[in-house]
Amino acid sequence: GCINITSSASQEGTRLNLICTVWHKKEEAEGFVVFLCKDRSGDCSPETSLKQLRLKRDPGIDGVGEISSQLMFTISQVTPLHSGTYQCCARSQKSGIRLQGHFFSILFTETGNYTVTGLKQRQHLEFSHNEGTLS
């Protein structure tokens, strides 16, 4: 089957959600690990990740269609320490498949705002930190 990984971001007030979505077939979930890395150009692994999610096969989902699994990493307040390059990755212990998403970046600016770049064009986000709104 076709397995892929996408990255996205959303904001709720001061919170920034970084989301790694893996699309896969139901039977491929077992043994899959999804993880998010920061500033790891070559050695992104579950061990060096900020967060990881081990997928489980859900017997409640019928059919053999494609399903998605999400890892959500929530930052309550973006600070200058969050500036850097992020990447969503996944790997399967069973099949040996490794997936690497596009790199995306958080840039904290001198004005106290931050931007998230490198996502799909519609997901290029600019956030005003103090108001917590999309600008």
């Epitope: 007030g13 001061t14 920061k38 500033d39 061990e47 060096t48 990740s49 900020l50 990493f73 929530t74 930052i75 309550s76 307040q77 600070t79 200058p80 320490l81 969050h82 500036s83 850097g84 106290g112 930190h129 917590g132």
Partner: antibody
Framework: EVKLVESGGGLVQPGRSLKLSCAAS????????MAWVRQAPTKGLEWVAS????????YYRDSVKGRFTISRDNTKNTQYLQMDSLRSEDTATYYC????????????WGQGVMVTVSS | EIVLTQSPTTMTASPGEKVTITCRAS?????MHWYQQKPGASPKPWIY???KLASGVPDRFSGSGSGTSYSLTFNNMEAEDAATYYC??????????FGAGTKLELK
């Protein structure tokens, strides 16, 4: 078990230098931003400096800017605080702490090391 | 720089008593964290993001607040709760600031 062990404190004269170390274990050190927080005798807590996971970005409180340098060696799981031009008001217990990545709380703290600046 | 003012500075409470410590910020902040520190020990995270209990903290503790006013409450004082409590926030560009602390003693 997360462990942070500070060393390098002691008595030093005003204007002199001292270098503190913090040896970390029990977690993937290179993934975490780190900080130094100090506490003057019988006083409250005061953030001193922070460093990002890769060591390329550093941040300081105004009163130590230009005098203190925070650094880290991810191959040795250790962070440092180089303190130059020390003043009597720098006398404090210095704590090594980890930054929680999802929040702005300091989630693990070392036992602290005493620095006394006096002639 | 945002200044955090804790009150009271010192207080005494009897076992079983309800205790409330407040922290006022000089400007509005998004979250408040609280730490417990006992003599000769390093601070421990106690409550984070205003109302979430840190690992191992008894559920008699609670945190609340918004804007410039935050509080730490425990429903029935126990001997082990005697300590100094500090509030802390983050904002840009002053970064991390702490309150001066509230020393809680057992009556």
């Amino acid at each position: 078990e997360v462990k942070l062990v500070e060393s390098g404190g002691g008595l030093v004269q005003p204007g002199r230098s001292l270098k503190l170390s913090c040896a970390a274990s029990g977690f993937t050190f290179s993934t975490y931003a780190m900080a130094w927080v100090r506490q003057a005798p019988t006083k409250g807590l005061e953030w001193v400096a922070s460093i990002n996971s890769g060591g390329g970005d550093t941040y300081y409180r105004d009163s130590v800017k230009g005098r203190f340098t925070i650094s880290r060696d991810n191959t040795k799981n250790t962070q440092y605080l180089q303190m130059d031009s020390l003043r009597s008001e720098d006398t404090a217990t210095y704590y090594c702490a980890t930054h929680n990545y999802e929040s702005t709380v300091f989630d693990y703290w070392g036992q602290g090391v005493m620095v006394t600046v006096s002639s | 720089e945002i200044v955090l003012t804790q009150s009271p500075t010192t207080m005494t409470a009897s076992p079983g008593e309800k205790v409330t410590i407040t922290c006022r910020a000089s400007s509005s902040v998004s979250y408040m964290h609280w730490y417990q520190q006992k003599p000769g020990a390093s601070p421990k995270p106690w409550i984070y993001e205003t109302s979430k209990l840190a690992s191992g903290v008894p559920d008699r503790f609670s945190g609340s607040g918004s804007g410039t006013s935050y509080s730490l409450t425990f429903n029935n004082m126990e001997a082990e709760d005697a300590a100094t409590y500090y509030c802390q926030q983050w904002n840009y560009p002053s970064m991390y600031t702490f309150g001066a602390g509230t020393k809680l003693e057992l009556k």
